[in-house]
């Protein structure tokens, strides 16, 4: 059970500092269905800086390195939550926001009803 | 520039409505990279229900439906923000966490130091 | 509130050309992909084509056959449909929109559309 307003301490405890083996993903490169990864940044936002992913095709990459247009790159969302400045500009108040993030790009079989 | 400790309502807003179109996602079963989505249930986190996807295969699935072994199904990772009762059990206290959650699969070509 | 604004249409002769813009408000343009669709007299809305966001990635329907080209201007929000050799049966009323899941993206999804711009080829 959550009351309404709560007291929120910012100092974030990173839980996954012992990530094993630690290393920066190179996936949105090397996936059949790549993607490009966008700054989103909101100074109203904590935290104010989102990166947002944007697929590169609107196939997939074959083994030859072609794209193909049988298959589908699809961008794999996400709600997340978001702490917004609520009244806007304040330093010290806030309220929950859910958001929806594209964090990847992965390649799905067509559904029947293709816009194509 | 934030405080250490702040208010928070945690009344949510959800920007997504407006989302169009909106959709109930089933690329989980129709990518070349699958996963299974496993319910993490922790009360002394908010929110206290998160999903996290595990790769069904090691390989990605090829035209013939068959999994494919020259490919690698790997997890797309995302940091998110979540609060934690601070300390335990506590009711309108909480401290800012950070965690690491796979929130799908995509299929990747594998990089030349590859295990096997 | 999202808006789209479609414009450029007309009445044109067979073998003409037009050029249709949309402009899109009250949304992160660079999505994903955008596209144009339309619906003929007395059909269902139809897929016409789209683009990626980095506007290198194209598709089309099979009924265009090199005569149409999309492309799109980040800067001024906006998405262009270049349709030559017009031929009877591309009299529609056009439309265009956001993509977010790109070419999955299925018509029956969305909620709201622009006002679309009618396109009639005749002689």
């Known amino acids: 059970n959550f009351p309404r307003t709560v007291m929120v301490n910012l100092n974030i405890h990173n839980r996954n500092t012992n990530t094993n083996p630690k290393r920066s993903s190179d996936y949105y490169d090397r996936s059949t269905s790549p993607w490009n990864l966008h700054r989103n940044e909101d100074p109203e936002r904590y935290p104010s800086v989102i990166w947002e992913a944007k697929c590169r095709h609107l196939g997939c990459i074959n083994a030859d390195g072609n794209v193909d247009y049988h298959m589908n790159s699809v961008p794999i969302q996400q709600e997340i939550l978001v702490l917004r400045r609520e009244p806007p500009h304040s330093p010290n108040s806030f309220r929950l926001e859910k958001i929806l993030v594209s964090v990847g790009c992965t390649c799905v079989t067509p559904i029947v009803h293709h816009v194509a | 520039n934030f405080p250490r400790t702040v208010m928070v309502n945690l009344n949510i807003h959800n920007r997504n409505t407006n989302t169009n179109p909106k959709r109930s996602s089933d690329y989980y079963d129709r990518s070349t990279s699958p996963w299974n989505l496993h319910r993490n249930e922790d009360p002394e986190r908010y929110p206290s229900v998160i999903w996290e996807a595990k790769c069904r295969h090691l390989g990605c699935i090829n035209a013939d439906g068959n999994v494919d072994y020259h490919m690698n199904s790997v997890p797309i990772q995302q940091e998110i923000l979540v609060l934690r009762r601070e300390p335990p059990h506590s009711p309108n206290s909480f401290r800012l966490e950070k965690i690491l959650v796979s929130v799908g699969c995509t299929c990747v070509t594998p990089i030349v130091h590859h295990v096997a | 509130q999202v808006q789209l604004v479609e414009s450029g249409g007309g009445l044109v002769q067979p073998g003409g050309s037009l050029r249709l813009s949309c402009a899109v408000s009250g949304r992160t343009f660079s999505s994903y992909a955008m596209g144009w669709f339309r619906r003929p007299p007395g059909k269902e809305r139809e897929f016409v084509a789209a683009?990626?966001?980095?506007?290198?990635?194209?598709k089309y329907a099979d009924f265009v056959t090199d005569r149409f080209t999309i492309s799109r201007d980040d800067a001024k929000s906006t998405v262009y449909l270049q349709m030559n050799s017009l031929k009877p049966e591309d009299t529609a009323v056009y439309y265009c929109n956001d993509m977010p899941y790109g070419l999955d993206t299925r018509m029956d999804e969305y909620e709201y559309w622009g006002q679309g711009t009618q396109v009639t080829v005749s002689s």
């Open positions: 683009i990626s966001w980095s506007g290198g990635d194209t």
